[in-house]
């Protein structure tokens, strides 16, 4: 007889996720001679420990604790590039701009980065079928804790000038339910974090107006403000130039506003 | 730069109480999960007691229901309360203070010699 599966409404565990885990975190400590002396194996062991066997609708940031001990990492406080519904650009960029950092080129975002997962409560399986979707099932499940936790420690890490880009193309540039605006924004520490400069990003090849003076940039701006952190906000009308500015800051045509 | 200064170590005899204290400067302290542990000669640095960010403690099974960590971030001060201490509680007792993505901090020592 086929033992009773809770159905989730999200999609499952990402197919290989426990050899996908592993090979990134031998592919990252390979790559960063910082991060050597990690034991990929103990990674998994508490990566996998954080869900397997528990209810994933009752995951805490205790659990990963174990996780994060072991990707503990050093980054530059004042290097730090937080992003909003604009993934790709932001990795992009550091990818090119190598002394800046975005979560996922963190030894723990890059592990977790586009993967799913979650287990059975008193089960040592991984659920492959269906995990819970954060607004239909429930919001303390394995991978949102884990997002969760680790973005609000990357913004407490913050210093100085923060940096933070934003998707243009969007209804809402800023939107205070994106992980950006509801745990993001309100633990970068005001004692280190002297501004937050925003990046809004254009979508259209003709696309000239001023979206810094969008409703919701004002909205970000008086968060900001009220915790006593500097905003300044700039308009970045050309996303491929200002990469290619990026690789080449001394072309002729990187002069002009980008 | 950062530094974890512990106090409050000392003698006492079997059943006798002892509060160490570690204050904390160069780090924004409540951000930081931290923790007491200890190091008896010959062997290995152990987890006493640990309080994170939020507030949640966890213990030795060792010295549970005798010692209580806790911290007051105002001060930018952790506390370990031990109470009915005994001779295996006898070592160097460190203040340690972690963040994920700020690396990993630990003071100099505070000696604790219990006697029967």
């Known amino acids: 007889v086929p033992r009773w599966r809770q159905q989730w409404s999200g999609p499952g565990t990402t197919k290989r996720f426990p050899e996908t885990v592993l090979a990134r975190c031998v592919k990252y400590t390979e790559i960063h001679p910082e991060m050597r002396h990690v034991d990929c194996q103990s990674v998994w062991d508490a990566f996998k420990g954080a869900f397997i066997s528990k209810h994933p609708c009752n995951i805490t940031e205790e659990d990963y604790q174990p996780l994060m001990k072991l990707g503990t990492q050093t980054v530059p406080c004042n290097k730090i590039l937080l992003w909003s519904r604009i993934k790709d650009l932001a990795h992009q960029f550091t990818q090119v701009q190598r002394d800046m950092f975005t979560l996922e080129d963190t030894l723990l975002g890059y592990l977790a980065d586009d993967l799913t997962w979650c287990g059975e409560f008193n089960t040592s399986k991984i659920n492959y079928q269906s995990c819970p979707d954060w607004r239909k099932d429930c919001s303390n499940n394995p991978v949102s804790v884990f997002w969760k936790t680790v973005s609000r420690r990357f913004a407490e890490a913050a210093c100085d000038v923060v940096h933070v880009m934003l998707n243009g193309s969007r209804s809402k540039i800023f939107d205070k339910n994106s992980t950006f605006g509801s745990v993001e924004v309100h633990n970068l520490q005001p004692e280190k974090v002297q501004t937050l400069e925003a990046w809004v990003i254009h979508g259209g090849r003709e696309d000239s107006r001023d979206l810094c003076q969008d409703p919701t940039i004002k909205e970000l701006e008086s968060i900001i403000s009220k915790r006593n952190i500097q905003f300044s906000c700039k308009n970045i009308y050309r996303p491929d130039k200002f990469l290619q500015c990026v690789k080449n800051p001394e072309d002729s045509s990187c002069t002009s506003e980008i | 730069q950062v530094q974890l200064q512990e106090s409050g170590g000392g003698l006492v005899q079997a059943g006798g109480s002892l509060r160490l204290s570690c204050a904390a400067s160069?780090?924004?302290?409540?951000?930081?999960?931290m923790g007491w542990y200890r190091q008896a000669p010959g062997k290995q640095r152990e987890l006493v007691a640990a309080i994170t960010s939020g507030g949640s403690t966890n213990y030795a099974d060792s010295v549970k229901g005798r010692f209580t960590i806790s911290r007051d971030n105002a001060k930018s001060m952790v506390y370990l309360q031990m109470n009915s201490l005994k001779p295996e509680d006898t070592a160097v007792y460190y203040c340690?203070?972690?963040?994920?993505?700020?690396?990993?901090?630990w003071g100099q020592g505070t000696q604790v010699t219990v006697s029967s």
């Open positions: 340690n203070a972690w963040h994920v993505f700020r690396g990993n901090y």
């Open positions: 160069g780090i924004i302290l409540r951000i930081y999960d």
